[in-house]
């Protein structure tokens, strides 16, 4: 299981991504939740679905990157990043993304959880 | 090997509730989501609802929102699918089925199936 | 809700035949379709998942194909023990939807 954990402040913009090259894919998926896509690229197109993430989100179809703008408390939540290899199988790796609010207190606490998980990636 | 061991059959009254059980074993519970599929007797498949039992989040066909309710107990690596105010066209054999990783509902693995009589 | 129309609801053909099941899906669904058999009295059994993946354990003569919304099952040569229930199902997009199912029996 890929499993990272990442600590932002509310209001700031945050990329979501992978440390390792992606494996030759036809299809990668960002949900938000299990059962809730935000964005679907295949060989032909990018494809954004109805959700709150609609309009400040943007993916890099290359690193499979997703950019997520203005990130708000209520964006907590764990996002799957799920790849279709050329294979046929899939792929899936997971971001816990807490989103804290700017007060002195929480963002000490931030750094120190980044610089934790910057240092420890857990796999 | 993965094994999902449901409860046993239920006979129940109209108005009444059940809740079925799905033990997992053979695999980390928390690393795939689980889904509930009903049969009635003679009849196709049926999605009822999902859950991914490292969150909770749910999912649910909206023929069953309100009714019914997708719990799991992680401490147990058990999966619950409890259904209110039963009638007659509830009678039906329901599943358990675990998809493939979270976000891949395709289901390799069933549970055996438990039998649910609602009559009067 | 995505409708997954399959057909024909019942088809009857003789060992050796080659057989084929459609699944017409109400919207773009990808690839995302799997494909099930189902005994009297048994639980599901996964054929085909991603259209045209075979399942682990399943023989070559099942078949998937297809993109967007239309996907074929195919038996390239039909066998006693393939007398079943099939069934498509679309996991593109929630809630799951499975289709009507296809009755296959024996001439």
């Known amino acids: 299981m890929h499993l990272v954990h990442m600590t932002v402040v509310s209001g700031s913009n945050v990329t979501l991504n992978i440390s390792e090259s992606l494996p030759e894919n036809k299809q990668l998926t960002w949900f938000y939740t299990f059962d809730q896509k935000i964005v679907e690229w295949d060989s032909r197109k990018s494809k954004y679905f109805e959700s709150k993430f609609k309009g400040r989100v943007r993916l890099d179809p290359q690193s499979g990157a997703l950019y997520i703008s203005k990130v708000q408390k209520e964006d907590n939540s764990t996002y799957i990043m799920r790849v279709l290899k050329k294979t046929g199988n899939e792929q899936e790796w997971k971001i816990k993304l807490q989103v804290l609010d700017p007060g002195l207190n929480d963002i000490f606490e931030a750094q120190k959880i980044e610089w934790h998980e910057h240092h420890h990636h857990h796999h | 090997q993965v094994q999902l061991v449901q409860s046993g059959a239920e006979v129940k009254k109209p108005g009444a509730s059940v809740k079925v059980s799905c033990k997992a074993s053979g695999y980390t519970f928390t690393e795939y989501t689980m889904h509930w599929v009903r049969q009635a007797p003679g009849q196709g498949l049926e999605w009822m609802g999902g859950i991914n039992p490292d969150t909770g989040d749910t999912s649910y066909n909206q023929k069953f929102t309100g009714r019914a309710t997708l719990t799991v107990d992680k401490s147990t690596s058990t999966a619950y699918m409890e259904l209110s105010s039963l009638r007659s066209e509830d009678t039906a054999v329901y599943y358990c089925a675990r998809a493939q990783f979270w976000t891949t509902p395709r289901f390799a693995y069933w549970g055996q199936g438990t039998l649910v009589t609602v009559s009067s | 809700d995505i409708q997954m129309t399959q057909s024909p609801s019942s088809l009857s053909a003789s060992v050796g035949d080659r057989v084929t099941i459609t699944c017409k899906a109400s919207?773009?669904?990808?690839?995302?379709v799997a494909w099930y058999q189902q005994k009297p009295g048994k639980v599901p059994k996964l054929l085909i998942y991603?259209?045209?993946t075979r399942h682990t354990g399943v023989p070559s003569r099942f078949s998937g194909s297809g993109s967007g919304t239309d996907f074929t099952l195919t038996i390239s040569s039909l066998q006693p023990e393939d007398v079943a229930t099939y069934y498509c199902q679309q996991y593109s997009t929630y809630p799951i939807t499975f289709g009507q199912g296809t009755k296959l029996e024996i001439k």
């Open positions: 991603w259209a045209s």
């Open positions: 919207q773009d669904v990808g690839t995302a």
